[in-house]
């Protein structure tokens, strides 16, 4: 529908305490260097404007589109060109272009500080004292550190951040009871962002068709009892909602969200009978719920996909009449019958499946070659299967830390030209698929490990694509988004790489690795070892096993010293020198 | 027992709509494509379409756009909906199970008893 | 596509050997996508034949079929009492939309 006024409609639609909110993080997403009081008063700014405009749709610009209206105001800011160099550029630039411009100057890794968390008292006082200011602010800091974060989802986090701090500042214990609260919101905004930044990537590297064909097997995993006709209308919306967030346009992303799910709600008895529960909460909450909601049953008696996929005639005609449909059908049909395969591997299938077609409906006898498709299938479900079995085996044989450090070796000894934080980062991810899915009985493990490595990988694509550094990295990341993990998996040892020079720098601790966290003294020596293979990509196992246990025994050794930092110094002298004679440096 | 039972047939006027249901029992109806044929009066069989197991439809040329094949696998029935009927359209309606699951062999081993339809004004 | 049945009626005595023969314009599917069928009045048609020269369940082994490409044959051995019907053959294309079936052979006591 077209509306006089578009930012009129969306403040009506979503209401002034939303619309405030998703304006900052849209701001705060595309500016992410800009202090917080500015980005308020540019919201506020806004938000005046758009009541005038609610008030009078033909009122002086109201007619303006978002983009127009919100690149004229970032535009505004004063030290545009001193703090972000050449994105000052995009100012010149008119619409479209001009947001295209800002989109393209998101940084996956801002330089900015590491969110360190106050005493509670401290938290609990700034609380109360200023409850609006202190939620604004937890929106702006997540957001400038993910400017990719679902922005609908960012609200219903801030309302959960809010319920925390009312309910745990009111507690005996306040510290018991707030700071497990926050850490789970921490891990759970890391993941959430994680996830839509790769369906971000998923639509701007590889197109709409791409996020489409993930989509339909995703939903149709969790509603196998919908019709087709009813999956593609929800992939179609949801494809939209997507479309617009990772395009910056939050407002119309939050707006098309919550009618997804209204729409989801009315018609939830030919979608899933898991959607009840959702359905009854309020919005935030809702949404939430619907994107998390379990795979509904399976419906009985599902006939064999053979029959119209492999033996029917009319197979070439179908695919000739109209492609995409027809691969879409194929994709939902499978994906419904196999909620134990992981939505990348499904997505393997319909590319062997649609490759196989096209090659087939071109011969002479077209049933004769595509026959057999079925059979080459089953080396692509056994890949993902074997490689789960043995990694789930080895986690459960070291344990989480020890499988992390296996990865952290893996993955250096294949790209060391990555940078150590980077590579510390993402093999510490890739480890904890462990934790989160070994637990899981069989059918369960594959779409719970795959799909989550496969967005631990996205992570590397981004971060290496801000300064490309491997071209074996740029290969698996741009070739295909579906064979990312079994690309990275291929990859050997890289025999090209020379040995980092040795700098004894690199391996000089102090006493202060005494007072780190257990989480941050594990990632002072994972980025030890990273810094150990890049030295010596040839070391073996066991050569990088004594190294690292004579490493933690001299941690622990000093820590428990009388004067810790001579300790570090002397002993630490000794261990780089015995280092270097194990392994040949 | 394995059958097939249509009803919906009756007296329609030239330009009116009807839809015709085919319960089965004793199968799922999900298992094999399921076709309609009809016959007009002291006439030979007419192929009308088929829908697949997994929900294709193939219609013949001239049924092509006014009749559509449509099934509910909870309800286990088969449907064919008629519209813009004329006077020709005059026939023994029969629902058919093929020997195929995925397209039309020609081969229907299991038919229902058939519903008349009669277009008149 | 058309399917052409030959003789359009044909009258026999019990024990008789009978031939009844259907062209199609083309070629069916896999060269053996052909059916024939058999109705009395008042009953819906029952398969006897598909695939050209294949027994459907129940039928008796008096009945047969040959033939290839777009000329087929049905055969009734020993013709029976309860043979006498209309019998028709239908067709399998290469597009399920193609199905056809013959104009139908009245077979009738001599």
């Known amino acids: 529908d077209a509306h006089k006024s578009e930012v009129a409609h969306r403040f009506k639609d979503l209401g002034e305490e939303n619309f405030k909110a998703l304006v900052l993080i849209a701001f705060a997403q595309y500016l992410q260097q800009c202090p917080f009081e500015d980005h308020v008063k540019l919201v506020n700014e806004v938000t005046e404007f758009a009541k005038t405009c609610v008030a009078d749709e033909s009122a002086e610009n109201c007619d303006k589109s978002l983009h127009t209206l919100f690149g004229d105001k970032l535009c505004t800011v004063a030290t545009l060109r001193e703090t972000y160099g050449e994105m000052a550029d995009c100012c010149a630039k008119q619409e479209p272009e001009r947001n295209e411009c800002f989109l393209q100057h998101k940084d996956d890794n801002p330089n900015l500080p590491r969110l360190v968390r106050p005493e509670v008292d401290v938290m609990c006082t700034a609380f109360h004292d200023n409850e609006e200011t202190f939620l604004k602010k937890y929106l702006y800091e997540i957001a400038r550190r993910h400017p990719y974060f679902y922005a609908p989802e960012l609200l219903f986090f801030a309302k959960r951040y809010k319920a925390a701090f009312t309910e745990c500042c009111q507690a005996a214990d306040k510290a018991a009871c707030l700071l497990p609260k926050l850490d789970e919101l921490r891990d759970e905004g890391k993941a959430s962002s994680a996830k839509q930044r790769l369906k971000c990537a998923s639509l701007q590297k590889f197109g709409e068709r791409a996020f489409k064909a993930w989509a339909v097997a995703r939903l149709s995993q969790r509603f196998p009892k919908a019709e087709f006709a009813e999956v593609s209308k929800l992939v179609t919306d949801l494809t939209k909602v997507h479309t617009e967030c990772c395009h910056g346009d939050l407002l119309e992303c939050a707006d098309d969200r919550a009618d997804l799910a209204k729409y989801i709600c009315e018609n939830q008895d030919s979608i899933s009978s898991k959607l009840k529960e959702c359905c009854e909460k309020p919005l935030l909450e809702k949404s939430h719920c619907i994107a998390e909601v379990e795979n509904d049953e399976m419906p009985a008696d599902l006939p064999s996909l053979a029959a119209d996929f492999v033996e029917s005639k009319d197979v070439c005609k179908n695919y000739a009449e109209a492609k995409d449909v027809f691969l879409g059908m194929f994709l939902y049909e499978y994906a419904r019958r196999h909620p134990d395969y992981s939505v990348v591997l499904l997505l393997r299938l319909a590319k062997t499946y649609e490759t196989t077609l096209e090659k087939c409906c071109a011969a002479a006898d077209p049933h004769e070659c595509y026959a057999k498709v079925f059979d080459e299938f089953k080396p692509l479900v056994e890949e993902p299967q074997n490689l789960i079995k043995q990694n789930c085996e080895l986690f459960e044989q070291l344990g989480e830390y020890k499988f992390q450090n296996a990865l952290l070796v893996r993955y250096t000894k294949k790209v060391p030209q990555v940078s150590t934080p980077t590579l510390v980062e993402v093999s510490r991810n890739l480890g904890k698929v462990g934790s989160k899915c070994c637990k899981h009985p069989e059918a369960k493990r594959m779409p719970c490990a795959e799909d989550y490595l496969s967005v631990v990988l996205n992570q590397l694509c981004v971060l290496h694509e801000k300064t490309p550094v491997s071209d074996r990295v740029t290969k698996c990341c741009t070739e295909s988004l579906v064979n990312r993990r079994p690309c990275f998996s291929a990859l050997e040892v890289d025999e090209t790489y020379v040995p980092k020079e040795f700098n004894a720098e690199t391996f000089t601790f102090h006493a202060d690795i005494c007072t780190l966290s257990e989480k941050e003294r594990q990632i002072k020596k994972q980025t030890a070892l990273v810094e150990l293979v890049k030295h010596k990509p040839k070391a073996t196992k066991e050569q990088l096993k004594a190294v690292m246990d004579d490493f933690a025994a001299f941690v622990e050794k000093c820590c428990k010293a009388d004067d810790k930092e001579t300790c570090f110094a002397e002993e630490g002298k000794k261990l780089v020198a015995a280092s270097q004679a194990a392994l040949g440096l | 027992e394995v059958q097939l039972v249509e009803s919906g047939g009756g007296l329609v006027q030239p330009g009116g709509s009807l839809r015709l249901s085919c319960a089965a029992s004793g199968f799922s109806l999900s298992s094999n494509a399921m076709g309609w044929v009809r016959q007009a009066p002291g006439k030979g069989l007419e192929y009308i379409g088929i829908i697949s197991v997994g929900g294709f439809t193939y219609y013949a040329s001239w049924a092509k756009g006014r009749f559509t094949i449509s099934r509910d696998n909870s309800k286990n029935t088969l449907y064919l909906q008629m519209n813009s009927l004329r006077a020709e359209d005059t026939a023994t309606y029969f629902c058919?199970?093929?020997?195929?699951?995925?397209?039309?062999?020609?081969?229907?081993?299991?038919w229902g008893q058939g519903t008349l339809v009669t277009v008149s004004s | 596509i058309q399917m052409t049945q030959s003789p359009s009626s044909l009258s026999a005595s019990v024990g008789d050997r009978v031939t009844i023969t259907c062209r199609s314009s083309?070629?069916?599917?896999?060269?053996?996508?052909l059916s024939w069928y058999q109705q009395k009045p008042g009953q819906p048609p029952k398969l006897l034949i598909y695939?050209?020269?294949d027994l459907a369940s129940g039928v008796p082994s008096r009945f047969s079929g040959s033939g290839s490409g777009t000329d087929f044959t049905l055969t009734i051995s020993s013709l029976q009492p309860e043979d006498f019907a209309t019998y028709y053959c239908a067709g399998g294309f290469s597009s399920s939309s193609d199905t056809a079936f013959g104009g139908g052979t009245k077979l009738t006591v001599l």
């Open positions: 058919a199970r093929d020997r195929h699951g995925g397209d039309s062999s020609g081969a229907f081993y299991l």
């Open positions: 083309e070629s069916v599917y896999s060269n053996n996508q």
């Open positions: 695939d050209a020269s």
